[in-house]
Interface confidence: medium
């Protein structure tokens, strides 16, 4: 059917609560595109009727709520005037029981559900809530080990929980809860977060922290030159390598012949407690085939990507 297949990583979701996924992979096209969602290679698109439990909302697929039986591979098809991309997203439902430690058996959670606080520092946890504009999120409540968090050391600021003077007792199972309203109906969103404390002053033992990029898209005109920095904080004695990859290949190897896209020379700034590393990627001339590809910055076990996107596409979902 002429569509290029792109396979995204698995998304692990909680049963019996709202979930949304945005088809943000920009197409290799200029101007108008259409976005259509399908489930398990069905020829019938996901409904666009907002009363449907599962429906397409602009470029998003929205589950109100996600439920057992919804696991599967969903396809988002982006059609432009001269191109077609089919993005495959594997959604897996799991049992979220942040309050019941006796049950156990959680899968390997993404970084959104595993967060680190730094001992003796002022730090914060983030509640990751990704929903379309049609979903209105109420104020966020935070819980630790099933009890609502109160006290002078804790401040709720938008989607973050600020923790001052982090202590060892702050490790444990947290949850952030918000009420989501959609078409007059209310749903509870509850995200469990496993919090560990690092005793290392700075940045989490030997796990580097990628400050930038943050898994996002960058709007860039065709033909322009683009330089993107990857900024990483890591411990002073770390042995981690930092590099840019595309399609699991070092960019310098992937573009060995054309040398159109190159990794820069790494630099670092030394602070008292940690090092800040910068390694850039340079696009001498942005070409059509660069759009929609995740360019990954790797730092030890940490990864983050950018995706190049044409400016202001008109996402008309039809």
């Amino acid at each position: 059917d002429g569509c290029k297949d792109i396979f995204m990583k698995n998304e692990i979701l909680s049963a019996s609560q709202p979930f949304a996924f945005n088809c943000t992979f920009p197409p290799i096209t200029s101007g108008e595109v259409s976005v259509t969602w399908y489930k398990n290679s069905s020829k019938i698109p996901v409904s666009k009727i907002i009363q449907s439990r599962i429906h397409q909302d602009e470029t998003w697929i929205l589950f109100l709520p996600m439920e057992w039986g919804d696991s599967g591979v969903y396809q988002c098809v982006i059609k432009g005037r001269d191109s077609c991309h089919r993005i495959h997203v594997n959604l897996t439902v799991f049992e979220k029981h942040w309050c019941d430690t006796s049950i156990g058996g959680l899968p390997n959670l993404s970084d959104e559900y595993k967060q680190i606080l730094h001992l003796g520092k002022d730090d914060s946890l983030t509640c990751h809530l990704h929903f379309p504009k049609s979903c209105v999120l109420g104020p966020i409540k935070w819980y630790k080990d099933c009890n609502e968090i109160k006290g002078e050391r804790f401040t709720v600021l938008e989607t973050r929980l600020l923790v001052s003077n982090v202590s060892a007792e702050d490790r444990g199972n947290y949850a952030c809860q918000a009420i989501l309203t959609h078409s007059g109906k209310q749903y509870e969103v509850l995200n469990g977060i496993t919090v560990s404390i690092t005793e290392r002053a700075g940045y989490g033992g030997s796990v580097p922290k990628i400050i930038y990029p943050k898994n996002h898209s960058i709007e860039v005109q065709l033909g322009t030159t683009l330089i993107v920095d990857c900024n990483v904080t890591d411990t002073k004695d770390n042995t981690n390598l930092r590099c840019w990859r595309v399609n699991n290949t070092l960019v310098d190897d992937y573009y060995d012949e054309s040398k159109r896209i190159r990794e820069g020379v790494e630099t670092h700034v030394s602070f008292r407690e940690h090092n800040l590393y910068t390694v850039n990627i340079t696009f001498l001339e942005v070409k059509m085939e660069d759009y929609g590809l995740p360019f990954m910055c790797h730092a030890g076990v940490s990864t983050a990507y950018i995706i190049l996107q044409l400016p202001a596409p008109d996402f008309r979902a039809y």
Partner: antibody, heavy 118, light 112 residues
Amino acid sequence: QVQLKESGPVLVAPSQSLSITCTVSGFSLTKFGVHWIRQTPGKGLEWLGVIWAGGPTNYNSALMSRLTISKDISQSQVFLRIDSLQTDDTAMYYCAKQIYYSTLVDYWGQGTSVTVSS
Amino acid sequence: DVLLTQTPLSLPVSLGDQASISCRSSQNIVHSNGNTYLQWYLQKPGQSPKLLIYKVSNRFSGVPDRFSGSGSGTDFTLKISRVEAEDLGVYYCFQGSHVPFTFGAGTKLELK
């Protein structure tokens, strides 16, 4: 505490429809799914289907064309309907609660005995 | 559909004996999320089934520690270390990994 109680007709004629109500207490139907299971002397325990907290259902493929499971959250009730009854639908019918955020089952109702006979 | 085969169908024991019941599935019952949704019930005459073990090896609240579950993939076992009179009845395994969910045929634990 958690309780489930099935209620329905004791005797139903072949080719008719069977409707059983499961009234629950001690938990919310917006947070937990409810399974339907039946037990016959010949077939043992047979899973019929489930209605999940969010509303969708899964059914036993062998009975799917005849089964409907629905619920009324405000009344804390779950309903099982089986059409075109046959004599081998004679069984003890149970509703059972989903174990916390899992596909499995923890608490069962006491069951209601249904005989299909003319 | 996943077929669960329980053996033996009847298990005569003396009080204080160890008892072992096998449940074999016709296909792997690991759910796509990594969990194995296999559980064990005990049903006594005139009663509804009671949950003993969930997710292969987790004892449900209030279940004595003489009950233990083990296994993976397609082979699962329920063990009772020392059978007591209240343990007599029919034991069923159940899988909740693949729709339609299914039960084993049952194993009757009875006195010799």
